[in-house]
């Protein structure tokens, strides 16, 4: 199941109501409104599936619905990465893929989606109520994370239904650039709307969507902060936590955000063999809004990558020394 922001269809104002100047100032707010509604709100979907053939085998698929370029994907279980979750896999488009038991195979499915096969027996086996989280670091959006789980009652071979409540968690990254412009635009929009409140506003028509497309979820900051304050992380059955095998699992992992070297002398190409798996039509997904720590009174576990991702095509080394010396 995908959720997409439904952009209101613009209905031109009736002719003769305003002069040229008035027309321009009236159209501008709606253009800005469209930008405010749609821009800067990428989403992450998570699909958890139990394989019918092997009951202890899970497939986790995650995708990023945004326009930015993905710099890193972290898959964890037992809660979000850095908040008690245990890292299962880390995927970088150019620098490679690393996974930890019981993850068996992590791979890119498309340039914006990944899949991870988990298998286990005994203590390291995932169980049905385990929460799996995917964190996408992208430029310029910043860091976005979503979580999903398979309900205990799910039949093998079936995908998880949508997760009932969003687990809100995002880094402050990515809101400085594009979002700053949008914020200014939104403030300007409000100013214009107040100036024109005595004038009749153009009518809004919902855009036509396909029958499958669900209705838009418009997360206003106030709603987001409320949810962030009221939706706790899912409780995890501790018996399903990973056991130490050959690997001592990297809880949290290094706070690498600010110092990832790219080594790139030129803009590297992504993995050569991108599969063409479509985004799933159904599955468990949660969208995460960016930059909610301030409202939720929560401190981000890492410095967000958006603060140190580099527009320079030569990568961070163009601005920093080796290893991002601080």
């Amino acid at each position: 199941m995908r959720t997409e922001a439904q952009v209101p269809a613009l209905q031109p104002p009736e002719p003769g109501l305003e002069g040229a100047m008035g027309h321009r100032t009236l159209v501008l707010p709606w253009v800005l409104l469209t930008l405010c509604v749609t821009a800067g709100t990428p989403e992450v979907w998570v699909q958890v599936r139990m394989e019918a053939t092997e009951l202890s085998s899970f497939t986790i698929r995650c995708g990023f619905l945004g326009s930015g370029s993905i710099s890193l994907v972290t898959v964890s279980w037992g809660g979000p990465n850095g908040a008690g979750g245990t890292t299962l896999a880390v995927l970088h488009p150019e620098r490679g893929i690393r996974q930890w038991a019981p993850a068996r195979q992590a791979r890119w499915e498309t340039q914006s989606s990944i899949s991870l096969i988990l298998e286990g027996s005994g203590a390291s086996s995932p169980c049905a109520n385990t929460t799996f989280c995917c964190k996408f670091a992208s430029f310029p959006e910043g860091s976005w994370e979503a979580c999903g789980s398979l309900p205990p009652s799910s039949d093998p071979g079936l995908s998880a239904p949508p997760t009932p409540a969003p687990i809100l968690r995002a880094d402050l990254a990515g809101i400085l650039g594009v979002s700053g412009v949008l914020l200014f635009g939104c403030v300007y929009l409000l100013h214009l709307l107040r100036r024109h409140k005595h004038r009749p506003a153009p009518r809004l028509q919902p855009s036509r969507t396909s029958p499958q497309a669900p209705r838009a979820r418009a997360w206003a900051p106030s709603q987001a902060s409320q949810a962030a304050l009221h939706v706790p992380y899912a409780t995890i059955n501790t018996s399903c936590r990973p056991a130490t095998l050959d690997t001592a699992h990297p809880h949290g992992g290094p706070s690498w955000w600010a110092s990832l070297p790219t080594h790139a002398a030129h803009r590297p190409q992504g993995p050569a063999a991108w599969a063409s798996t479509p985004i799933p039509a159904r599955g468990s997904f949660v969208s995460v809004e960016n930059g909610l720590y301030a409202q939720a009174g929560e401190r981000p576990p890492h410095t967000g990558p958006g603060l140190t991702l580099f527009p320079d095509p030569r990568g961070p080394r163009a601005m920093e020394g080796p290893l991002g010396v601080r």
């Epitope: 880390v90 995927l91 620098r95 490679g96 893929i97 990297p250 992504g270 063999a273 010396v325 601080r326």
Partner: antibody
Framework: EAQLQQSGPELVKPGASVKISCKAS????????MNWVKQSHGKSLDWIGD????????TYNQKFKGKATLTVDKSSSTAYMELRSLTSEDSAVYYC????????????WGQGTSVIVSS | DIQMTQSPASLSASVGETVTITCQTS??????LAWYQQKQGKSPQLLVY???TLAEGVPSRFSGSRSGAQFSLKINSLQPEDFGSYYC?????????FGAGTKLELK
Amino acid sequence: EAQLQQSGPELVKPGASVKISCKASGYTFTDYYMNWVKQSHGKSLDWIGDINPDNGGSTYNQKFKGKATLTVDKSSSTAYMELRSLTSEDSAVYYCSASGPPYVLLDYWGQGTSVIVSS
Amino acid sequence: DIQMTQSPASLSASVGETVTITCQTSENIYSYLAWYQQKQGKSPQLLVYNTQTLAEGVPSRFSGSRSGAQFSLKINSLQPEDFGSYYCQHHYGVPLTFGAGTKLELK
């Protein structure tokens, strides 16, 4: 500039143990996994394992389980590898190497520590 | 574990020549193959990763390519500083494994 400074050469007797060190400087120690790689004389490279300095979690190549133990001291930004029950097969140059996410590329290398096992 | 079969084991060439080293993998590693250069008595250094991305400071005479499970490192117009050993390594999961190496010697 990032640097990995390894301890000096070791001459040890068969059956003994040895602990070699790798001191990191010029970067935040906990941001990179520390890998250890073995290079026998005139031969290829063998990955021993790595350690996450942030929490001490380690991963070993099955081939070196029971032979090598990886540890870190965050306060001194130093990684250690202990090799036990040494035989002549363990005579080699051992390198430490720092790797950034996703911890599968060996970005920076120490100068190597020569270990010679001889009676 | 992923096996890396590197060839040739040794290679003699002159300054100005072009040489190619290959590496075959036992499993699909997508484009996640790296090359390291090791000069006599020194530590290895990352040269190329993700098949063809040059590490920082690596001259453009080095280039990487892939054909199926076979990966190649090509060095155009060999320079005196290019002589030494070259190793391939997959960067698709652990354990990390390396090719046996290619020793590039001055003819």
